[in-house]
Amino acid sequence: AGVFELQIHSFGPGPGPGAPRSPCSARLPCRLFFRVCLKPGLSEEAAESPCALGAALSARGPVYTEQPGAPAPDLPLPDGLLQVPFRDAWPGTFSFIIETWREELGDQIGGPAWSLLARVAGRRRLAAGGPWARDIQRAGAWELRFSYRARCEPPAVGTACTRLCRPRSAPSRCGPGLRPCAPLEDECEAPLVCRAGCSPEHGFCEQPGECRCLEGWTGPLCTVPVSTSSCLSPRGPSSATTGCLVPGPGPCDGNPCANGGSCSETPRSFECTCPRGFYGLRCEVSGVTCADGPCFNGGLCVGGADPDSAYICHCPPGFQGSNCEKRVDRCSLQPCRNGGLCLDLGHALRCRCRAGFAGPRCEHDLDDCAGRACANGGTCVEGGGAHRCSCALGFGGRDCRERADPCAARPCAHGGRCYAHFSGLVCACAPGYMGARCEFPVHPDGASALPAAPPGLRPGDPQRYL
């Protein structure tokens, strides 16, 4: 067990002469906060998985108001470290995503508006217990400077936090079979602490907190003898002479989810569904209020002004879970007809229709499009006897064969800046405008011309398009 720690040193203009506009203005003061997402660096599923090693949000930084005419300085930062606790071994190689978010504090309807200012990513090698590693990354016109380290929580030590150390019982030497615990020579390597209740006779462990059974024993704590009667559904022949092989402990045995979380098995591990008020890989993070920003993926946090009263996350379309951390697979309902391919974009469903079909759910049969193909997932649209291709985002031209930059069409109105991000384009709006494409003016009295937002999405929430 241990903690990954991230210290943000500065977030300010990059090295070039063209200083970026300050993200805050006298009319729209704002403050920054940061989110870090960690994944094991070399696991096959890491690229698309959620933050399997953990995630953390910083506190909000001090409120900043731009001085008119002054260049954007380094922006005031939140106090303290971002800490991501990890319960198991530190993997050594990890991937990170660090996001810089802006919280606008103008007279927004329904509370402050969030928008993503910058996002950096990388993969690094890092031994637990080592010194702080410093990094500098550019994101658009901004530059982020930060340091990070992984440290073990006592009694764990070592580069992966898998060895355990205890103070010496005798002043001169360690007990039988136990070595001094370098670099803490005054401590001794301790026997591994297995899962609480693990049978000392029939169980053992190679990692802290696990319980592996000797042959002939099973159950989460290795207290159940393998049946010697005939097996109803054996998994295979047993090398023990005592009968049949019983399935070994599964990832949810002994329920690794704390604080009343419920465990469900996944192909490689397990997933905890946490009750309100708790989150984290094993529901181990508690005492959370809306001030901690526990709602992911643009979820709106309501209630929970103090740690004893639960908060509720109102999730935007496409996300669910007590912290909006799970993507809803709405394509499983097979909404696209006529063999259309379903794409869940988070904010909406899209059907990519086969040639000859069109419509939001590919429900229209197009005669004009018979035998006509639009490349790269483009959709053929009927047009008075001639076919026309409606191209998937990222492509253009008559038959959608030309690759297009999602920002090339200048989709952000009123001087908004377009950024291509992992999940599509994001518009950073000029002061006085809001909306997914900066199309709505914010009225001086704080009301906006924005239409009613869908449930769980507030005006000003960052909205992404693939």
Epitope: P15, V120, R134, D135, I136, R138, C407, A420
Partner: antibody
Framework: QVQLQQSGPDLVKPGASVKMSCEAS????????IHWVKQKPGQGLEWIGY????????NYNVKFKGKATLTSDTSSSIAYMELSSLTSEDSSFYYC??????????WGHGTTLTVSS | DIQMTQSPASLAASVGETVTITCRAS??????LAWYQQKQGKSPQLLIY???SLEDGVPSRFSGSGSGTQYSMKINNMQPEDTATYFC?????????FGAGTKLELK
């Protein structure tokens, strides 16, 4: 303006070592990393590693570990790269470049190294 | 190491033409991609970073796009001074790795 001034060409014998320099000016030396990149004539670019002059942390391409040693002197704003046990394979053009961990935004003019007996 | 496959190896274009160079990474590099221009006998120069951010002082006819493992750089309205070799480079993981380069000549 930012400038990186590299030392002159070197002709050295096989088996010897060479230490080339990269003098930075026009910015705070400890604020950015110094990367080193190898380029054989008419060929592509190969990243050797970088040094953080702020704390002398280094990050090497495994291929150049044991071959290249990166150091820096903050008092004179100079970064150094020493190449050891030289062979004809090390004959090349070597660039230093200022940057973040991901972006090399200013480059020196390069140093030519010739290894020949 | 992450491999970067750049194409084409060389091409010739006339003044005013649009040129596209592509780069494929052996795994997702999350926009950690830069493009560099190297003219004959000169040092490389940074053009684009974070896949689509234009470095200060670089003409706006240069643009970058892409995501995941596929990236491209486009030169709209080719000019004689764009004759050079162009390299892509990933910086998601160490070691930083470059593409083999694309030599762009004037037709």
């Amino acid at each position: 303006q930012v400038q990186l001034q590299q030392s002159g060409p070197d002709l050295v014998k096989p088996g010897a070592s060479v230490k080339m320099s990269c003098e930075a000016s026009g910015y705070t030396f400890t604020a950015y990393f110094i990367h080193w990149v190898k380029q054989k004539p008419g060929q592509g670019l190969e990243w050797i590693g970088y040094i953080d002059p702020f704390n002398d942390d280094t990050n090497y391409n495994v291929k150049f570990k044991g071959k290249a040693t990166l150091t820096s002197d903050t008092s004179s704003s100079i970064a150094y790269m020493e190449l050891s046990s030289l062979t004809s394979e090390d004959s090349s053009f070597y660039y230093c470049a200022r940057g973040t961990s991901a972006t090399l935004d200013y480059w020196g003019h390069g140093t030519t190294l010739t290894v020949s007996s | 190491d992450i491999q970067m496959t750049q194409s084409p190896a060389s091409l010739a274009a006339s003044v005013g033409e649009t040129v596209t160079i592509t780069c494929r990474a052996s795994e997702n590099i999350y926009y950690s991609l830069a493009w560099y221009q190297q003219k004959q006998g000169k040092s490389p120069q940074l053009l684009i970073y974070n896949a689509n951010s234009l470095e200060d002082g670089v003409p706006s006819r240069f643009s970058g796009s892409g995501s995941g493992t596929q990236y491209s750089m486009k030169i709209n309205n080719m000019q004689p001074e764009d004759t050079a070799t162009y390299f892509c480079k990933q910086a998601y993981d160490v070691p930083l790795t470059f593409g083999a380069g694309t030599k762009l000549e004037l037709k």
